[in-house]
Structure formats: C-alpha cells, structure tokens
Interface confidence: low
Amino acid sequence: NECPELQPPVHGKIEPSQAKYFFKDQVLVSCDTGYKVLKDNVEMDTFQIECLKDGTWSNKIPTCKIVDCRAPGELEHGLITFSTRNNLTTYKSEIKYSCQEPYYKMLNNNTGIYTCSAQGVWMNKVLGRSLPTCLPVCGLPKFSRKLMARIFNGRPAQKGTTPWIAMLSHLNGQPFCGGSLLGSSWIVTAAHCLHQSLDPEDPTLRDSDLLSPSDFKIILGKHWRLRSDENEQHLGVKHTTLHPQYDPNTFENDVALVELLESPVLNAFVMPICLPEGPQQEGAMVIVSGWGKQFLQRFPETLMEIEIPIVDHSTCQKAYAPLKKKVTRDMICAGEKEGGKDACAGDSGGPMVTLNRERGQWYLVGTVSWGDDCGKKDRYGVYSYIHHNKDWIQRVTGVRN
C-alpha cells in the first residue's frame, strides 16, 4: 500500500526524498543547522517514521525548532548585554560579557563576545564554552592624594586614598593589627599579628598560640579607628596561613595570609593592592599607613600615614647591630636618620606602598613588622619584604596583578 506524500518541515528535510513511499519504507526527518527536531515536546537530532501496511505513516512529521542557548550563565563581578533585539538567546544570537569597571577587568582582555552555537551552547572564540574571568583591579584608588612634597610626622590619610588597608579587629570591635587586601579574598598581614605573645622562657610557637579564624574579623573600607563608617565591610575569616619559615623570635619571614569567608564588594573605598613586580629601589619614597599609636602613646581617631624613604640594607643592619638584632634579606627598612617618622604599636601588618608613576598604580613593598621603639633617631622601621616572599604569596593565594 502507498503512503501519502510527505512535506518536509520548515527548516528541515526528509531523506530519502522520493515521489512515492510504500509499505516498510522508512524516512529520516532532520533539521537545518541550528534547529532541532521537536516531537511531543522532546528535542532530538533526527526522527524516523515508517510507511505502515494500512497505507498510513507511523507518526506525524515533527517540527523543526530553532536551538535555544537559554539565559547565559551569570558572571561573577560581570554584566551581560544582548546584541540582538528582544534579548534573543536562539541560534546565532550574540551576547557580550563585560566586567564591573573600574573595579574589575577581564582576564587576558578577552572580547567577552559569545555566540549561540548549533549545539545550543554559548561559545567564545578563545574560551569555548568557559565563562570569562573578572579580576579585581589593583592599586588604582579613585581618590588620589593631594600631592605634598613630604608628609611630616605622619598625617591623617584622606578618605579613600588607601582602599586596600584592612583592619584586623577582635569581635568586640577592638582593632589589633593592620593588613592589605590582595585579590578579592585574601589579606596579607604580619605573622606576629596572628598569635599570642610567647612565653619568654619557652618561646616556641604552638598551634594553641595561634588565633583561630573565629577569634577575629577583617574590616575593609575603614577610615575612623573606632567610629563606624558607612563604607566599612565586616568579613569573617575562613583560614589563616603563616609563612612556613616564620621565626617569632627574630621576626624572619614575618608575613601571613588570611583567607576571607566571603569576598568584599570592591568599590571606591575597598580595592586590592598590587603585588610588587620587582625589587624595591633604595631611596624610593614609600607610604606607610595604620591606626597605630602616635607620639604621646595615643591612638589616632582616623587612619594615619607617613611618607619615608627606603633605607640601604647595610645601613639598617649597622643600626641594629649594637642591639644584636638581625636584619635579614626578607626584611626591608625605611625611615629617616633623625627619626620622628615611623610605624608603631597597632600598625603591625599594615601596608608600606609605593607609586609606580608610569602606570599610576600602587604596589605593596612591605608590611609593618618590627623596630626599636617608635621613631627613634638612628633606628629605622623594619618591614617584612613582600618581594622576597612573593612566590609563596602567589602560590597560596593564586593572586596575580
């Protein structure tokens, strides 16, 4: 028996295509590129029907439906714009991912353009089906310092000019150290900030001496020391990592990393600092910030900063030789021979940064570590040298500039 003539579906074809079909003849229905066979609400690549003994087809011809890539995946710290009218997500439609500028930028300067493929997947020429990555922009504060030739004896920092500074605070709100934001979920600070004072009789660092992640919190976007700030973000701590070669007696490798429980929202008041690209030049001017003690042993109301020069390593070693204190290669010194400008108690772990004038970007040089009293003549502030431990920092955090 002969079966009725078949019409191929719109955007599809029938194979084999012949004038007449008889009992037991089979037909394969397929669709054009970018379309799928739709039968009983089920999508498939092909559909087969057969001419039956009674001269009818075993099934109705299915329809061809355009492939739909559906809503594209959300991009963390990014936005999606549709290039097609009516926000179409069907075959050959185009979308563009972009990052939340100016606080995030796309890794490898990817175009961010994705096209809906015939397979129903959003595809990028370089990344394939993988989403792009929005990386935090580092060291580019929205508010720049009013340039002054020098800062004498420290001065209050202008709000928003040090957006990478972190306050390490006890849960009752009492600050105890500083730190710097790296990437979107790490704080670099001093290792000595993360443990109790050791017993001078037995100065061995034990696990029980370490602060637990739940003993303190991180506050970003902070300006005032104790007063609340509408820009501040309070973040829990997931994990702490002290440098494996940290020596609490000599302060060698006095650096630690704090992983945040959640990522802060980057904005004009919260932005990471860049890791150093190379070694620091002696004589270069650096800025040190913190909420630590000032002269007269008073704590300031707001964030303070000082501008001081990097000091030659051998000069610093000689200054501390009479005190039998070692200034090792993982340390960097800064300050002025006459004294008067220095970090002090409570500044520990806080940032020492320098401006790369060509790029207009700020880089982390060191973290406040130790010294002989504060601001003493012929004594310099000693900082943990970030360049020396950059590989370790990058290995633990995965942060790249």
Partner: antibody, heavy 119, light 111 residues
Framework: SVEESGGRLVTPGTPLTLTCTAS????????IHWVRQAPGEGLEWIGY??????VTWYASWVKGRFTISKTSTTVDLKMTSLTTEDTATYFC????????????????WGPGTLVTVSS | DIVMTQTPSSVSAAVGGTVTIKCQAS??????SAWYQQKPGQRPKLMIY???TLASGVPSRFSGSGSGTEYTLTISGVQCDDAATYYC?????????????FGGGTKVEIK
C-alpha cells in the same frame, strides 16, 4: 563541665534568672551560649556571651526579653515577660575552642534546667 | 537571622545502611556549620564542626560535607546506637553579629 540552675514553675509575666556554672575551665576564655528546647520540639538558639569582653549577641526573636550577663564563674540568663510559649528545658553550652567566639560548635553542654510557665 | 532548613524530618534505615541528612542555609555561611546528635532525655552532643571536622570521640562512620549554603551529614554503616535526632547549626559571624540558629531536626530510626 557546665551546669544550669534556677529553672522552676512560674506564672506568665514573672521574671526569672537562670545560672550557668562552669567548672574545670576558665569561663573568660570561652563563649557561652544559651539554647532552649520546648517539650517534644527542636533546639532553639537564644544567644551567647564572650565572658572576657562581655560582648553578647542574641537571636532576633529574643527582642530584648532575655539578657545574658556574667560574673567571675557563672553566666546568667535573665528572662522577663515570660509566656507559656517559653516553657522549655534551657541549656547552657560552651564552644569547643577558646579565645573569643569560635565557629567550632558547642562541645560542652549542661544537663538543662526546666522552666515551666503556667497560670 | 539565618534560616537552616533541614531535610528530611525523619528517616528510617537498616543496620549497616547509609543515612544522609541535608541542611540548607538561607545565606552563604562558608564553613560555619555544626551537627549535633540528641537522644531522648539527653543533652545534645557535638558530632561535626567546621562543616566537615569530626568532633573528638565521634565514630568515623559519621561524616560532614558542604560549604556556602548546602551541608550534609552522612552516617555510613548505621548502628543501632545511632538512633537519635540530629540537628544542624549555623555558627556564623558577619558584620559584627553572630548567628547560632539550628535546623528543625531529623529523627533517625533504625529498622
């Protein structure tokens, strides 16, 4: 160990103070939580105090009716405006790790003290 | 406050079988969750903290997993002694506040 005391039968509106007594550890090094359990029901968190600093936090449903405070070796839970809904066994519990609030769970629980609010 | 939604409310298992209890937090609480066991007329006992760390003295057949908003307690090779009600708890710190909310509990019966 920790042990609660002070639970009894009271009429609605009567204030009541429960006491949590610690022994074998320095209460100042730990956060002490109060948790309650109505008959046949689940556990309900009330709040906590970190004794060294005196910092307290409460569940939002407490709405100022309960206050947690401390002495040198005890932590008190002062309860006001009691209703029949507050009938429960009240537990105090210590966090596993010392040094402030620790997200290490409550490792040391008292046997509980029963508070019955009835007219 | 954070809401901890625990499922199922009750479960029955044969000795040697596996029990899985889930807890969903209403917001990301990182690894700040704990699990407790409570037998009738007894005080609760800490089983798991930090989402996956086994508390001291807890048999290794108990395990915890998850982070963010989804947490799971698994009892592999269930014993008669495991019949109890199990509770999840948030131990979350954020923005100067602490949350210790418990889930509604799961009653485990052994067949």
């Amino acid at each position: 160990s920790v042990e609660e005391s002070g639970g009894r039968l009271v009429t609605p509106g009567t204030p009541l103070t429960l006491t949590c007594t610690a022994s074998g550890f320095d209460i100042n090094n730990y956060a002490i939580h109060w948790v309650r359990q109505a008959p046949g029901e689940g556990l309900e968190w009330i709040g906590y105090i970190y004794a060294r600093s005196g910092v307290t936090w409460y569940a939002s449903w407490v709405k100022g009716r309960f206050t947690i405070s401390k002495t040198s070796t005890t932590v008190d839970l002062k309860m006001t405006s009691l209703t029949t809904e507050d009938t429960a066994t009240y537990f105090c519990a210590r966090v596993l790790a010392g040094g402030g609030y620790a997200n290490t769970g409550l490792s040391l629980w008292g046997p509980g003290t029963l508070v019955t609010v009835s007219s | 406050d954070i809401v901890m939604t625990q499922t199922p409310s009750s479960v029955s298992a044969a000795v040697g079988g596996t029990v899985t209890i889930k807890c969903q937090a209403s917001q990301n609480i990182g690894y700040s969750s704990a699990w407790y066991q409570q037998k009738p007329g007894q005080r609760p006992k800490l089983m798991i903290y930090g989402a996956s760390t086994l508390a001291s003295g807890v048999p290794s057949r108990f395990s915890g997993s998850g982070s963010g908003t989804e947490y799971t307690l698994t009892i592999s090779g269930v014993q008669c002694d495991d019949a109890a009600t199990y509770y999840c708890q948030s131990n979350y710190i954020s923005s100067g506040s602490v949350d210790g909310t418990f889930g509604g509990g799961t009653k485990v019966e052994i067949k």
